[in-house]
């Protein structure tokens, strides 16, 4: 580390005095200090001498000696005060520029350390500092305004008490620049626009920034539009607005509109699409299949997407049957707007009952007319099974009817003993019916199938069981021949058929 002679941190001299500052290092050394007149510099290998024969208040400042070859970058410093009774301040710069929230150093150096107790910072023409101005003072460096704000961009003077009166420095202009985080913020409204040919339309492009220096323009299909600009300042932001008014739109006005704004940080752009149509339109669609199947007791939400211009004048859900004349409860119908021209309508059908199967229609109306979208809702049921014993042309026959949706599959089991359900160990024979005959298959109803098993001779210590299953569940019915006739066992009850 270089060494300065005299080896004191501060040196106080009078104007006109001779000052010699000597710096000695291991290698070559360099001096750095405030730009001031009358200094002469003499270098001799590893030492450098800075001297003046006529010190003035302008020589007040901190002089630092560095050794460029030192890898540790060590330095030594001495602060020189040239105390001029007429000049308490040495101002190193008359303009200071910082960004908001940085510390701003106003470099008015006190020429006499004794005056430190009576210093203050004021605005020019004796005006007090703005409220919330947080500052500190260093006799070596000057006044520091901490976390400077844009509003603190003012002309300041440093004040010192000398013999009971305040002596001011020359003024220092502080410029606090807004931190521009990026390109200007943009809004382009509306985000989407539809008009019928001949109608009026308005597109507004606006940009705002903390700094006034930015440009904004509106373009249509890559052509820049000449639109007068309105400017404003509020909420600490500069705003520039371009408004495109079209009295009677035509097809050539349709297309892509881009709002573009730029500043030193870069460019922002946002776009919207303007659609010009010949007449009103109303389109209904659903992402769901229009044919729905749900298990009885479960819930379902029917959703319809509506695209319309102009807006809807009416809409409703209607139940078209076939089971009853009930209508969907309004509280179960829900509407949400996705954007100006698209809406979603939902009908909630919780805990579906058999009578709620059928057709549900969503109807909507606008000046373009009525449109409807119809869902067909079929309920799924687990099979219900029943078996009867009958004679046809003298042949004994077991008839199994199974009712459910989807269409049930039918299996016959013949097993030993009397039981209401054949288990694997008892099974003597199994017949899977590949083609049970459909007895009824009405839309929205259960499908009823019938399977016929001819029985040449009834074995009395055996059970015939008809089982039916589908994707929802299964059901069964056991038939037990006895000498007096026949017993049939439904799943949960006992029935006697003579």
């Amino acid at each position: 580390i270089p060494v300065i002679e005299p080896s004191v941190p501060e040196l106080v001299v009078k104007p006109g005095a001779t000052v010699t500052l000597r710096c000695v290092g291991n290698g070559s050394v360099e001096w750095d200090g405030p730009p001031s007149p009358h200094w002469t510099l003499y270098s001799d290998g590893s030492s450098s001498i800075l001297s003046t024969n006529n010190a003035t208040f302008q020589n007040t400042g901190t002089y630092r000696c560095t050794e460029p070859g030192d890898p540790l970058g060590g330095s030594a410093a001495i602060h020189l005060y040239v105390k001029d009774p007429a000049r308490p301040w040495n101002v190193l710069a008359q303009e200071v520029v910082v960004f908001e929230d940085q510390d701003a150093l106003l470099p008015c150096l006190l020429t006499d350390p004794v005056l430190e107790a009576g210093v203050s910072l004021v605005r020019v023409r004796g005006r007090p500092l703005m409220r919330h101005t947080n500052y500190s003072f260093s006799p070596w460096h000057g006044f520091t305004i901490h976390r400077a704000k844009f509003i603190q961009s003012q002309d300041y003077q440093c004040s010192a008490l000398m013999g009971g009166r305040k002596v001011m420095s020359i003024s220092i202009r502080l410029k606090v620049q807004k931190v521009i985080p990026g390109p200007p913020a943009l809004t382009l409204v509306p985000a989407e626009l539809v008009r019928i040919r001949g109608e009026a339309a308005q597109i507004v492009c606006s940009a705002s920034s903390v700094d006034v220096n930015f440009d904004v323009f509106l373009q249509h299909n890559n052509t820049k539009l000449a639109i007068p600009q309105q400017s404003d300042f509020h909420n600490n932001r500069y705003q520039k607005v371009l408004t495109l008014n079209l009295d009677q739109v035509d097809f050539q006005h349709a297309g892509n509109y881009s709002c573009v704004a730029s500043n030193v940080q870069g460019k922002h752009s946002t776009s919207m699409f303007f659609r010009v149509v010949e007449s009103a339109y109303l389109n209904l669609s659903s992402e769901q299949n229009l044919i729905q199947e749900v298990t009885v007791g479960e819930g379902l939400n029917l959703k319809v997407m509506v695209e319309a211009y102009p807006g809807l004048q009416g809409f409703n859900w209607t139940y078209l049957g076939p089971f009853s004349d009930h209508q969907p409860e309004p509280k179960l119908a829900n509407a949400t707007t996705k954007d100006t021209y698209r809406h979603t309508f939902t009908l909630s059908l919780p805990r579906l009952k058999p009578s709620e199967a059928g057709r549900y229609s969503f109807l909507a109306r606008n000046p373009g007319g009525w449109r409807a979208l119809t869902f067909e809702l079929t309920l799924r049921y687990p099979p219900e099974v029943s078996v009867i014993w009958t004679f046809i042309n003298g042949s004994g026959t077991l008839l199994c009817a199974a009712s459910g949706y989807p269409q049930p599959n039918v299996t016959w089991l013949q097993c030993s003993g009397h039981t209401d359900r054949c288990d694997e160990a008892q099974v003597l024979q199994v017949w899977d019916d590949p083609y049970p005959e459909v007895l009824s298959q009405e839309p929205f109803h259960k499908v009823t199938v019938q399977s016929l098993l001819t029985v040449e001779t009834l074995e009395h210590n055996q059970t015939y069981e008809c089982r039916a299953h589908n994707s929802v569940g299964s059901g069964s019915w056991a038939f037990i021949p006895i000498s007096a006739g026949a017993h049939t066992h439904p799943p949960d009850e006992f029935l006697f058929t003579p």
Epitope: N393, W431, D433, P434, Q450, L453, T454
Partner: antibody
Framework: QVQLKQSGPGLVQPSQSLSITCTVS????????INWVRLSPGKGLEWLGM???????DYNAAFMSRLTITKDNSKNHVFFQLNSLQPDDTAIYFC??????????????WGQGTSVTVSS | DVVMTQPPLSLPVSLGDQASISCRSS???????????LHWYLQKPGQSPKLLIY???NRLSGVPDRFSGSGSGTDFTLKISRVEAEDLGVYFC?????????FGGGTKLEIR
Amino acid sequence: QVQLKQSGPGLVQPSQSLSITCTVSGFSLTTYGINWVRLSPGKGLEWLGMIWRGGNTDYNAAFMSRLTITKDNSKNHVFFQLNSLQPDDTAIYFCAKSGGLRLYYAMDYWGQGTSVTVSS
Amino acid sequence: DVVMTQPPLSLPVSLGDQASISCRSSQSLVHSNGNTYLHWYLQKPGQSPKLLIYKVSNRLSGVPDRFSGSGSGTDFTLKISRVEAEDLGVYFCSQSSHVPWTFGGGTKLEIR
């Protein structure tokens, strides 16, 4: 015992219809279905369709537009009608009883066959 | 439609020999309920076809036990362990797993 007797013409003009009646005995048409099958030198045996015991019908899609099968349970009659005949419809036409679930609907009894020639 | 193929068209055998008649389907004959509905018929000269075997391997009542059926999926075989004179005729395989039901072209069993 089970019997199926067929009655119908032997010669049919092109574009005309073929009608065959199958009269059954020894079982009930309410218990068993009836199939119709034909045998021709060029195509071998072809299943044309059937009428189930409950009256439902299943047709081979190749003949659906011109085939009708009906029945009269009380008279034990099954009726077969094939429209718009062409020379390649020349074949022996059989009615055959479905064996029911115990035989998995395989055809356990057949009629004697009706030999049909389509020619002008 | 399921195509049933029966090679060969003619199968010459000596009486008392074993005969094997094959049948192949263009797709699996397993029905959605898991069963395979493949049947065998015999048509003797001047007669109507008669059912011999149903559901791959079940002999119809009255059919001699020298007739047996086997196979699964798409490949099926009818075996006659000792051919007798009354066995001569055309053998047809048939499926009722998928509508429309279809028949093979037939294999004629004749004396060598």
